[in-house]
């Protein structure tokens, strides 16, 4: 699990690879703060509730975020 117990950043390792938007339970975008100097993206998978840290600088992850927001805007009235 790519999560650390320190009070600073949550993610130790990050992935450049996208996942299927439909397999996501939750996608958290944590802005940079005094505790962690970088934006962090934490994906919770539907299967087993596994958490994955995604690289916000990766083009593939940016495409994933775009797909997720498109899905959400379709669902909202």
């Amino acid at each position: 699990v790519p999560l650390s117990r320190t009070v600073r950043c949550t993610c130790i390792s990050i992935s450049n690879q996208p996942v299927n938007p439909r397999s996501l339970e939750k996608l958290e975008i944590i802005p940079a703060s005094q505790f962690c100097p970088r934006v962090e993206i934490i994906a919770t998978m539907k299967k087993k509730g596994e958490k994955r840290c995604l690289n916000p600088e990766s083009k593939a992850i940016k495409n994933l975020l775009k797909a997720v927001s498109k899905e959400r805007s379709k669902r909202s009235p």
């Epitope: 450049n16 996208p18 996942v19 083009k59 495409n63």
Partner: antibody, heavy 119, light 107 residues
Framework: EVQLVQSGAEVKKPGATVKISCKVS????????MHWVRQAPGKGLKWMGW????????TYADDFKGRFTFTLDTSTSTAYMELSSLRSEDTAVYYC????????????WGQGTTVTVSS | DIQMTQSPSSLSASVGDRVTITCKAS??????IAWYQQKPGKAPKLLIH???TLQPGIPSRFSGSGSGRDYTFTISSLQPEDIATYYC?????????FGQGTKLEIK
């Protein structure tokens, strides 16, 4: 040198199943997603989908849902594409292609595997 | 899905000619376009990504330009070894799409 080496040509009968392999070398297999592309005889390139090589999760393009299965064997750094219930229109060259996910494009391709479906 | 309309579908030119191929996306793809060369019986080869960034080892006679929905691939001086089919690819989306291809022949 980064290489994607695919299995050899296959001739199959309609209704059969084919499994193509794509063995990688020269980089860490689980660092990049693997995509599959189809090219029918005399036609253009068609993207089929990808597999996340870290978690083994496949995603299929709409036209390739149902009979197509992408899998991995991380112990041998090999990606597989299986196609069941073969039809004559599945006759094509199938390519695996590494995605340089950070920038988003396909940078290295396998040499292609020709699948011929004929009775 | 984003559609990529590539033109022309075929092109005949002489050695030394300037050759131009265009791809038009159905929506803004924010410069996320790559160009590939495919010779008969071979896999596609990446020439250019992010509209105009040449891959290492690719001759400088190949170039790309464009923005928004409209993109151009140019060979400044056609060489005999450039005979191939060329494809554009948009990757501004999780669903990748190729252009239909342009077959380039020598006059």
């Amino acid at each position: 040198e980064v290489q994607l080496v695919q299995s050899g040509a296959e001739v199959k009968k309609p209704g059969a199943t084919v499994k193509i392999s794509c063995k990688v070398s020269g980089y860490t297999f689980t660092d990049y997603s693997m995509h599959w592309v189809r090219q029918a005889p005399g036609k253009g390139l068609k993207w089929m989908g990808w597999i996340n090589t870290e978690i083994g999760e496949p995603t299929y393009a709409d036209d390739f849902k149902g009979r197509f299965t992408f899998t991995l064997d991380t112990s041998t750094s090999t990606a597989y594409m299986e196609l069941s219930s073969l039809r004559s229109e599945d006759t094509a060259v199938y390519y695996c292609a590494r995605n340089y996910d950070y920038d988003g494009y396909f940078d290295v391709w396998g040499q292609g595997t020709t699948v011929t479906v004929s009775s | 899905d984003i559609q990529m309309t590539q033109s022309p579908s075929s092109l005949s030119a002489s050695v030394g000619d300037r050759v131009t191929i265009t791809c038009k996306a159905s929506q803004d793809i924010n410069k996320y376009i790559a160009w590939y060369q495919q010779k008969p019986g071979k896999a596609p080869k990446l020439l250019i990504h992010y509209t105009s960034t040449l891959q290492p080892g690719i001759p400088s006679r190949f170039s790309g330009s464009g923005s928004g929905r409209d993109y151009t691939f140019t060979i400044s001086s056609l060489q005999p070894e450039d005979i191939a089919t060329y494809y554009c690819l948009q990757y501004d989306n999780l669903l990748f799409t190729f252009g239909q291809g342009t077959k380039l022949e020598i006059k």
